[in-house]
């Protein structure tokens, strides 16, 4: 922490500008009025202060805000964004999309994934849900941040706004925020034709459930291998060979580059080698002919 | 414009391990597996695994027996190769190569990655 | 593991001339699953065919692949200064994926 010094007279300071950077850490502190620097952050950035300069400004206005910025503040960081942490940005409310475009900006090409899911989460917590304006904010400014959101913020997503999102921004998401997702989206689409369903419907289907992958197996809609990689294990075990070779068509043949990837492995460990041989890949590893398979947890079940 | 941009050019000691980096840009991550494949001075190619960077998942040439590891950073776009217990056949230039899922050719290539292994 | 065998290892060609290049399999290679790539000095590889006949883009039409079964051939139809590059192919059909030696073809 910065030592407390009383500040020399002829150092005192009226206002935010240039000749600040001549001054050293202790001098800053003693100073520089943090009323003073938060009505006139908007000077902040434009001065080339030292990283070391920048932590006494942050010391600054955390004493003067312990309970978080205010916005009018946080508007107006620049460069000292970078030297928040996220416990720092949790404390905020924010609610201004040029806000985190300001934001988001600086942050580009700094090491802040954190910082930045942290600050999406508080402009999502202050607007109240994730409206388009945000959703069209987030896809312009910080492709891919939409999967720093949890699944609860996700779920705060009208349908209507699923279709300004792209595929590039689902790249990052999970399974668990592709499950609040999915749902959403086939509600958004559900008015298309086939072709034009797939095409998207496709981000979204790491979180399709069996039955739904099933109905697209009958629409010949030719997923790649890309797509049926995505698919949650638990909604490709069940496929059975032909449901398969009719939901990937053409790209069928691609199951034996990827046979050792999961879930394409585990799949082809549920499936009777007869009906693998059908699809003339040479995939080997399934159930062995004359086999009988008895599910135990059906067994359980009924005990 | 689609680019692999691999790290910089390494000299290691036997026995110590190197981790090389490998950033995607300009296509999306996930619908492309990453490979990696080394060719010793003056020698041909040889496939070292790959990595299935949506789930994860990786395959590995069984002649790297548990000294390969692959990872991914869904975030930064990059993956990276780790191969440890390094020896001098080891030296070597490393690619990591561009395989779309569900084919098994490799249309974009990083400039690659030359590891020196001497004592 | 497949082993691919290249022949031959070297070949120095004159322009305008036709050359091939033989990649035979130890066993069955599924053709959908072969490649060809092209490498010049202190360059990446680059890939030319795949899936043993599909050009791939940007690749001059003078080159050519075929083949099935274990045995495949790259034709240079008529050679150029550019080609000089050691030419490789390369299996995916079983693990591990192997290539083969490598030709290297010089500009007389």
């Known amino acids: 922490d910065v030592e407390r010094t009383t500040c020399p007279p002829e150092k005192e300071v009226h206002e935010i500008d240039e000749s600040l950077i001549f001054y050293k850490k202790r001098e800053l502190e003693a100073c520089v009025d943090a009323a003073l620097l938060a009505a006139q952050m908007d000077r902040v950035d434009a001065i080339p202060f030292t990283y070391e300069q920048l932590d006494v400004l942050k010391h600054k206005l955390d004493e003067l805000y312990p309970q978080g910025y205010p916005e009018s503040v946080i508007r107006h960081l620049g460069h000292l964004f970078l030297k928040m942490s996220p416990e720092d940005i949790r404390k905020w409310n924010v609610t201004s999309l040029e806000t985190l475009k300001a934001l988001l900006k600086v942050s580009k090409g700094h090491e802040m994934s954190a910082q930045v899911a942290t600050l999406i989460d508080r402009v999502v917590v202050g607007r109240g849900q994730l409206d388009k304006d945000t959703v069209d904010t987030l896809t312009a400014f910080c492709p891919g941040c939409l999967c720093s959101l949890s699944p609860e913020r996700l779920s705060s997503v009208p349908p209507s706004v699923i279709g300004a999102v792209r595929p590039q921004d689902l790249d990052t998401c999970g399974p668990r925020q592709l499950d609040v997702l999915y749902p959403k989206a086939r509600l958004a689409f559900q008015n298309m034709s086939g072709s034009e369903y797939f095409v998207k419907i496709r981000p979204f289907l790491g979180g399709a459930p069996t039955e739904d992958v099933k109905a697209l197996s009958q629409q010949n809609v030719s997923m790649d291998l890309a797509t049926f990689m995505k698919l949650r294990r638990e909604a490709v075990l069940p496929l059975t060979v032909a449901e398969v070779q009719k939901l990937l068509g053409p790209h069928v043949e691609g199951l034996k580059v990827e046979e050792q990837h999961s879930p394409v492995r585990d799949w082809i460990l549920k499936q009777r080698q007869d009906d693998l041989d059908t699809l003339g890949l040479g995939l080997q590893g399934g159930i062995p002919n004359g086999y009988l398979i008895l599910d135990l947890s059906v067994r359980e079940a009924l005990s | 414009e689609v680019q692999l941009v691999q790290s910089g050019a390494e000299v290691k000691k036997p026995g110590a391990s190197v981790k090389v980096s490998c950033k995607a840009s300009?296509?999306?991550?996930?619908?492309?597996?990453m490979d990696w494949v080394r060719q010793a001075p003056g020698q041909g190619l040889e496939w070292m695994g790959d990595?299935?960077?949506?789930?994860?998942?990786?395959i590995y040439n069984q002649k790297f027996n548990g000294r390969v590891t692959m990872t991914e950073d869904k975030s930064a776009s990059t993956v990276y190769m780790e191969l440890s217990s390094l020896r001098s056949e080891d030296t070597a230039v490393y690619y990591c190569?561009?395989?779309?899922?569900?084919?098994?050719?490799?249309?974009?290539w990083g400039q690659g990655t030359t590891v020196t292994v001497s004592s | 593991e497949i082993v691919l065998t290249q022949s031959p290892d070297f070949q120095s060609v004159t322009p305008k001339e036709k050359v091939t290049i033989t990649c035979s399999a130890s066993?069955?290679?599924?053709?959908?699953?072969l490649s060809w790539y092209q490498q010049k000095p202190d360059q990446s590889p680059k890939l030319l065919i795949y899936?043993?006949?599909n050009l791939a883009s940007g690749v001059p039409s003078r080159f050519s692949g075929s083949g099935s079964g274990t045995d495949y051939t790259l034709t240079i139809n008529s050679l150029e200064a550019e080609d000089a590059a050691t030419y490789y192919c390369?299996?995916?059909?079983?693990?591990?994926?192997?290539f083969g030696g490598g030709t290297k073809v010089e500009i007389k």
């Open positions: 300009g296509y999306t991550f996930t619908d492309y597996n």
């Open positions: 066993s069955s290679v599924i053709s959908s699953y």
């Open positions: 390369h299996q995916w059909s079983s693990f591990p994926y192997t």
């Open positions: 899936r043993t006949s």
């Open positions: 990595i299935n960077p949506s789930t994860g998942g990786t």
């Open positions: 190569a561009r395989r779309r899922i569900g084919t098994g050719y490799f249309d974009v």
